[in-house]
Amino acid sequence: RRDVAHGILNEAYRKVLDQLSAGKHLQSLVARGVGGSLGGGAGDDAEPLSKRHSDGIFTDSYSRYRKQMAVKKYLAAVLGKRYKQRVKNKGRR
């Protein structure tokens, strides 16, 4: 079960990184049900790259790294909650 959860997490993380690199927003993923609320996911990743510098949003490697780590933590928390909930629900049956 833990392997399955890790598999889901890695797959979800890959999808989100694809979205980030395309300049898309995690919110769309949250809206499709992967998310929950851990602070919302409003994003410094919402705008296309061309617009970001004038908007004061950094695109250097450190900023990207910190954002990626934040996404990973966010998904781990959200999917961890879901997994615990699923186990809890199974126990009630």
Epitope: G41, D44, F58, S61, Y62
Partner: antibody, heavy 109, light 111 residues
Framework: VEESGGRLVTPGTPLTLTCTAS????????MGWVRQAPGKGLEWIGD?????TTDYASWVNGRFTISRTSTTVTLKMTSLTTEDTATYFC????????WGQGTLVTVSS | AAVLTQTPSPVSAAVGGTVTIKCQSS????????LAWYQQKPGQPPKLLIY???NLASGVPDRFSGSGSGTQFTLTISGVQCDDAATYYC???????????FGGGTEVVVK
Amino acid sequence: VEESGGRLVTPGTPLTLTCTASGFSLSRYAMGWVRQAPGKGLEWIGDISTYGTTDYASWVNGRFTISRTSTTVTLKMTSLTTEDTATYFCARDYWLSLWGQGTLVTVSS
Amino acid sequence: AAVLTQTPSPVSAAVGGTVTIKCQSSQSVYDNNALAWYQQKPGQPPKLLIYAASNLASGVPDRFSGSGSGTQFTLTISGVQCDDAATYYCLGGYDDAADNAFGGGTEVVVK
């Protein structure tokens, strides 16, 4: 960026500082907290991502908690000692590119 | 946590001259370039000058420049002006953000 909530407290009293922004949407940026004791240097406390995930300096040891709503970022401080007397700054994004004027926290018995 | 050691204060500079401030980290910063420089004047909050080791922040005069990689970094102020009298801090960003830290600061005095 504007910080508020700083005041004189006695050791052990919990305190919450608030950070708000005008001219930009706070929810679109990671936000960090930094402090500066009187006459001393800057000390990085931690930051919060747009997803609500947090990172803290190793010295924080769970005493401080950063959280956010769509319009505010807060720093909750517990187990305060006189060593925590400082001006607390809130700053925008991971590079701390835009700072508030700071709010003074004085811990004294 | 990382330790960042800066050039001892104060550093004196003549108007029009050049000032160099060094920052040494006890461990390599992320991607060898996750280092920023800030300027702080008395009674004011710090101001970002340089990020990612060598990138000039928005609105910062180009007499400020940053260089270095890994554990050794330098802030250079060319054509020093009276307005540059301030304390300068470096900030290192690391693989583990728990290690993030500022240097102790370097005061620049302009004669």
